[in-house]
Interface confidence: low
């Protein structure tokens, strides 16, 4: 999906209002220094591409974050503020339903969410600096 047409300001607002709190709740008890940020992004559309990938694409040691509250809110935000995003995700959603829900918060999932926090920080930092 091409994220260049998204309403970045609205996504930033949604992140600050809700998604950030859910990510921090998921990470509760874990220090941000516990993980090295290895995933980066070079511009806001690129950040959204990486955020989508880390949030919705299963990895070998973290089967699925897609059913977590922050993921659901991320999906809703992208659907709301990125024209045509919902349509591109229909097939991906069908495939996701066939996967089992992750039962334990593994260290690898915590690491992945730590990466997400870093990506979101890059995405929203301009707004944060103005506040």
């Amino acid at each position: 999906y091409d994220f260049t047409n998204c309403d970045f300001q609205k996504i930033e607002a949604d992140y600050l209002r809700t998604i950030s709190k859910d990510l921090i709740t998921y990470m509760s008890g874990t220090k941000s220094t516990d993980f090295n940020n290895t995933v980066s992004c070079s511009n806001r559309p690129h950040c959204l591409t990486e955020i989508q990938s880390l949030t919705f694409n299963p990895t070998p040691r973290c089967a699925s974050l897609a059913k977590e509250m922050f993921a659901r809110k991320t999906k809703a935000t992208l659907a709301l503020w990125c024209p045509g995003y919902s349509e591109t995700q229909i097939n991906a959603t069908q495939a996701m339903k066939k996967r089992r829900k992750r039962k334990v918060t593994t260290n690898k999932c915590l690491e992945q969410v730590s990466q997400l926090l870093g990506l979101w920080r890059r995405f929203i930092r301009t707004l944060l600096k103005k506040q």
Epitope: T4, N5, S40, N43, R44, P45, R125, T126, K129
Partner: antibody, heavy 117, light 107 residues
Framework: QVQLVQSGAEVKKPGASVKVSCKAS????????MHWVKQAPGQGLEWIGV????????TYNQRFKGKATLTVDTSTSTAYMELSSLRSEDTAVYYC??????????WGQGTLVTVSS | DIQMTQSPSSLSASVGDRVTITCRAS??????LAWYQQKPGKSPKLLVY???TLAAGVPSRFSGSGSGTDFTLTISSLQPEDFATYYC?????????FGQGTKVEIK
Amino acid sequence: QVQLVQSGAEVKKPGASVKVSCKASGYTFTSYWMHWVKQAPGQGLEWIGVIDPYDADTTYNQRFKGKATLTVDTSTSTAYMELSSLRSEDTAVYYCTRSLDGFFDYWGQGTLVTVSS
Amino acid sequence: DIQMTQSPSSLSASVGDRVTITCRASENIYSYLAWYQQKPGKSPKLLVYFAKTLAAGVPSRFSGSGSGTDFTLTISSLQPEDFATYYCQHHYDTPWTFGQGTKVEIK
């Protein structure tokens, strides 16, 4: 208004180093990436690398790894590029330019670096 | 690395002419393309980003179009101040690369 003011022209001998500065004003320095671009005489534009003033994270064009070193001083909102082991082919105008989404909306006036024996 | 190829490398035109410059990427860059204008001895100036969004203060005679690999910068009615060199640049991911430039000269 946003301004990027670069240091003046330099003449250096082969093998020497040079450090070019770029002072930013009119915006929050740590909110934008700072890039450096090379333009050799009569030639096009070539991206050297980028630094994130927020955390000093750098990414370089492979061609300039070992040649250029990017740093920032957030206390003075200044970005620096040091070029080492200068050769005649490093003679060029060097620009600093900022970005948020990968395109460059404001540019410095350019610094001419001349390498000559 | 993504290669950006501009054409033509130079063109001669008269005031009032419609001018079209094309830029081709070596792979799909979606809409992550910017256009710049540079006059001799001056810094480049941003004209268009995200392929079609006009930068602040840029006259409406400039327009950008395209997506994927093929892009176009159009000047609908060339003005005396438009004689310059124009560069495309992808902003998809690092390393950012520029086209080789198109010089627009007076006929």
